[in-house]
Interface confidence: medium
């Protein structure tokens, strides 16, 4: 029997140009007499338009929803009802372009046709959109609260916040022709739950979101988003009834940015310039194209690019890269956020140079991405180190810690965390090099001493980049660098004169002077220690929950030993910044280090003191009894303590520990305690330092109190931030 | 003084039970890791099984896994090797051992008392 | 896990100095510095003689040393006595709490 045919509905969003009619600024209130007879005439135009062409057989419905600048653009939406075989065919580009071929063919033409009677159509300014029935649910949800701005050139517009009445709101924006909009959005509270989503387009089409945030992100206070051109919609869905606008939102035209760049690299190793997507750190718009061409000077050299919380894979089965493409040497390449730096090395073997091109595949963008570019020398591209073949990275071989995710750079050792003497190959512990003490058959433990060496894993790396052999050589109180440098920068690590953590004992004044307190209206909820005059370190969980994120609510006491009183040596601090770890992973505890910048300078005092930071190169053994200081809980459970409590704990090596966490020890984490517990960290202690004594007398500070199973548990070791795998972030903070 | 004493052991039919026992004395044993080792007569030592002082992580040699479970009393002082279905192959001298001593340490893995064993033989 | 590698045999006369050899592999004595060694008269339980690759237990005499060297740990006895005359055991860390040991080196003093 006949079989009646399947019709679809196909949707279908966009503009057109109006070019003998001007917009006004009651067009943007649509309960105005001008929006409802405006909206009425070029309603009945676009209908007449779709109808005139064969597409008029398949007209369902229209809408005109909104006005702009251009002289008069018409944003409106339309529905056909397609049979099913033929909705492929009616692809908006082939909708785009009948309509276009209709407007064209009326252009001078002298007779009358329904759709010119009032509106003079412009045919190069006509634009159709895939739409489907869910964005026009979303557009008219938002009809209650519509706000079109024209931003102009050199204009930087702030939007009017959202009505609280409703429950979604859209801002319509539009620039001049040939610009781009760059949003800026500021999250104001600290805990919110609006969710804000940015489209390049007029209205909320699901296929043109560029980005959508949610939730006041601590991750990222500030967002700067580019469209691709010079339209853009943002759409606010209510969280939390506030009174407050809980963000900021701001609009600028911003010229179009080329991203085309050819460099020649000078003959020396490391980096030597920054590539960037335009406007950086802004997301890079939609239709953001780069091309870096890149010349080598040598064959010797490769070439390296080094990326920060971003990496490259290979892309399976041509699928769109959702975070970017990149192709390299005709590799197809996909860009993935991380919380981890990575390098991706790229051999040169002809001079022709190297093309880099970077490609937003999909409307949803992301942050800017930067990159490090520099050469690398093939032959041995990590001297001294090892090369991560995972990400790129060059990292300490066998330390003890495996700093390549394989655990590569600490397979094969012939000595693991101690010198290899040079005659025999057997291993002798690392404080005996250049000791003053011969410890190896012939004395190649004592040799160079005096001299520059080769830099490797225990080296120090002096200022002006040269090494030295002997490990630990900071503010020993003799000079082993040629300029000084392990001898600069240490006015810290010195206890005052003096004469709970679980299993621990009270300390005296001035005994712990860098130690901190960190609270929140007076009431004790974590550690910290001084490393610098405005500087304190803590861990970044203790800013975990959203209530604790804003600076206002911290005050931070130093020179404190008592909780329920002040001493005159006490003093306290607002804090002007708080910053945590790019990388911090709440879940594992990874990068688990924040910063806060006290709001003046520390003035010392034997109470007060900054602890002594150690370069990447520092060597804390395991076996060495360390301190950790704190008024955490005197035991699992219980309350914090009122005296400023200390304990010895032993540091662990990394195999052990990581065995007993089931491998959720990260490089950038190391263990204290005793495998017999009770002597350990607890709550309250988090941040706080865990400090070794040098043998100078000086103190530094190896870790910060993050984790654990318990406190004082058998077999479960105390894991802190380690110090030495976070310090180059510290320092480029600080410094 | 410290020291350590297996008994237990004799001469069993394959596919039997046995249990041995190491009494602990002269020292705080609920503060040691426990070790079994065995010494095959004329061969070499095989460590058997491992348990920390709450057995809260437990160890076994592939060669036992499944068959011989350690135990500990730490209120007698006392260690257990309990051995299922043996084996010709498991007749040996069975040693207990402590874990060395040490002021709170992490693990050393290695044994500073022995006890003198005790004999197990599995008859076929 | 199989037993570490040691020679059968070693000697020395009274005075001279022996070194013993124990191989692994990298999951074992090249991974971890968890190398003991110990000496086991005829017909008595062995005797822990070094521990953590180098550490001498009390009471130990200091002619005993330990080393390592990659996959391979050494232990020297020198100045060598008629009573150093005994099996001598490596054993290691293998990971996953378990310990393995090596098959024994007779060592005979000439």
């Known amino acids: 029997g006949y079989k009646a045919e399947v019709m679809v509905s196909q949707v279908y969003s966009g503009s057109l140009r109006v070019l003998n009619r001007h917009f006004s600024q009651d067009l943007t209130r649509r309960e105005s007499s001008a929006f409802r007879s405006e909206t009425a005439k070029a309603q009945k135009m676009l209908k007449e338009l779709i109808t005139s062409t064969r597409l008029g057989t398949y007209y369902n419905s229209s809408s005109v929803y909104s006005f702009g600048e251009g002289p008069l653009t018409c944003f409106f939406w339309f529905i056909l009802q397609i049979p099913e075989h033929r909705r492929l065919m009616l692809s908006p580009e082939v909708v785009q372009a009948l309509l276009v071929e209709e407007l064209l063919s009326t252009v001078n033409s002298s007779a009358a046709v329904p759709y010119r009677a009032e509106y003079e159509v412009d045919p190069e300014g006509l634009v159709i959109l895939e739409a489907s029935v869910k964005d026009i649910a979303a557009l008219n949800s938002t009809l209650g609260c519509y706000r079109y701005s024209y931003v102009g050139q050199g204009q930087v517009l702030r939007l009017k916040g959202p009505d609280h009445l409703a429950s979604s709101c859209l801002w319509h924006l539009q620039g001049p022709k040939d610009l781009m909009l760059k949003l800026r959005l500021e999250w104001t509270l600290a805990e919110c739950r609006d969710r804000l989503a940015m489209y390049d387009v007029a209205g909320p089409l699901e296929k043109r979101l560029i980005t959508s945030v949610y939730g006041c992100s601590r991750q990222e206070p500030v967002v700067e988003v580019l469209a691709s051109g010079a339209i853009m919609a943002v759409v606010w869905k209510k969280g939390l009834h506030s009174y407050y606008d809980p963000f900021v939102l701001s609009v600028q035209p911003v010229v179009f940015q080329a991203c085309e760049v050819n460099l020649t690299l000078d003959n020396r190793l490391d980096s030597q310039g920054v590539l960037s997507t335009p406007y950086f750190p802004s997301y890079y718009s939609p239709q953001t194209h780069c091309s870096w061409h890149l010349t080598v000077p040598s064959l010797d050299y490769g070439l390296a690019l080094w990326f920060d919380a971003y990496a490259l894979r290979r892309q399976k089965y041509d699928l769109p890269c959702t975070q970017g493409q990149w192709t390299i040497q005709n590799r197809r390449l996909c860009g993935l956020r991380i919380l981890q730096p990575y390098a991706e090395r790229i051999p040169v073997v002809a001079t022709a140079g190297i093309t880099i091109n970077f490609t937003s595949q999909i409307s949803l963008t992301g942050p800017g991405v930067r990159v490090h570019y520099g050469l690398y020398n093939q032959s041995d591209p990590c001297p001294g180190e090892f090369l991560c073949s995972v990400n790129g990275l060059c990292v300490p071989a066998c330390d003890g810690v495996k700093d390549c995710p394989n655990g590569l750079d600490e397979r094969n050792c012939v000595c693991r965390a101690t010198f290899q003497c040079k005659e025999d190959s057997t291993c002798i512990s690392l404080p005996k090099v250049c000791d003053g003490q011969p410890d190896c058959l012939n004395g190649s433990d004592e040799e160079q001493c005096q001299e520059g060496v080769p830099c490797g894993t225990f080296t120090f790396q002096c200022e002006d980049r040269s090494c030295v052999k002997k490990p630990n050589p900071q503010c020993d109180g003799r000079p082993d660098c040629r300029d000084g440098s392990d001898e600069e920068h240490c006015d810290c690590g010195l206890q005052g004169p003096s004469s709970r953590i679980v299993g621990g004992a009270v300390s005296s004044e001035g005994e712990w002077p860098w130690q901190a307190s960190l609270q929140v209206r007076g009431r004790h909820i974590c550690g910290g220690a001084l490393i610098a005059d405005r500087w304190v370190i803590t861990a970044a969980h203790c800013f975990q929950e959203d209530s604790m994120a804003s600076t206002v609510l911290w005050t931070v006491f130093l020179g404190k030993v008592w909780q329920n009183s002040r001493w005159p040596g006490e003093v306290s601090f607002k804090v002007s910044r708080l910053l945590l770890h790019p990388y911090h992973e709440e879940d594992s505890h990874d990068y688990d280090v924040a910063l806060l910048q006290l709001d003046h300078p520390v003035v010392r005092s034997a109470a007060v003191r900054p602890v002594c930071l150690p370069a990447r190169s520092h060597f804390f053994e395991p076996g060495l009894h360390c301190w950790i200081t704190g008024w955490g809980a005197l035991r699992e459970g219980g309350p914090i303590s009122n005296a400023l409590q200390k304990v010895d704990v032993q540091l662990i090596p990394q195999d052990l520990c990581s065995e007993v966490y089931r491998y959720q020890v990260t490089p950038r984490m190391l263990c204290a305690g005793y495998r017999k517990g009770k002597k350990d960290a607890c709550q309250g202690d988090s941040g706080g330092p865990l400090v070794c004594k040098a043998l100078s007398g000086r103190w530094f500070l190896a870790g910060l109190v993050s984790w654990g199973l318990g406190c004082g548990r058998p077999n479960y070791f105390g894991v802190y931030t380690r110090i030495t795998g976070v310090i180059s972030w510290i320092q480029q903070v600080v410094t | 003084e410290v020291q350590l004493v297996e008994s237990g052991g004799g001469l069993i039919q394959a596919g039997r039970s046995l249990r041995l026992s190491c009494a602990a004395s002269g020292f705080t044993f609920d503060e040691h890791v426990m070790y079994w080792v065995r010494q095959i007569p004329g061969k070499g030592l095989e460590w058997i099984s491992s348990?920390?002082?709450?057995?809260?992580?437990?160890a076994y040699a592939d060669s036992v896994k499944g068959r011989f479970t350690i135990s500990r009393d730490n209120a007698k002082n006392a260690l257990y090797l309990q051995m299922n279905s043996l084996r010709a192959e498991d007749t040996a001298l069975y040693y207990c051992?402590?874990?060395?001593?040490?002021?709170?340490?992490?693990?050393?893995?290695?044994?500073?008392?022995w006890g003198q064993g005790t004999t197990v033989t599995v008859s076929s | 896990q199989s037993a570490l590698t040691q020679p059968p045999s070693a000697s020395g006369s009274p005075g001279q100095s022996v070194t013993l050899s124990c191989t692994g592999t990298?999951?074992?004595?090249?991974?971890?510095?968890?190398v003991s060694w110990y000496l086991q008269h005829p017909g008595k339980a062995p005797k822990l003689m070094i521990y953590e690759v180098s550490k001498r237990p009390s009471g130990v005499p200091d002619r005993f040393s330990g080393s390592k060297s990659a996959n391979t740990a050494s232990l020297t006895v020198s100045g060598l006595q008629a009573e150093d005359e005994a099996d001598y055991y490596c054993s290691s860390y293998a990971g996953s709490n378990k310990v393995v040991f090596g098959g024994g080196t007779k060592v005979t003093v000439l």
């Open positions: 051992a402590r874990e060395k001593d040490g002021d709170f340490y992490y693990y050393y893995f290695a044994m500073d008392v």
């Open positions: 348990i920390t002082w709450k057995s809260d992580i437990i």
């Open positions: 990298s999951s074992d004595v090249g991974y971890y510095n968890y």
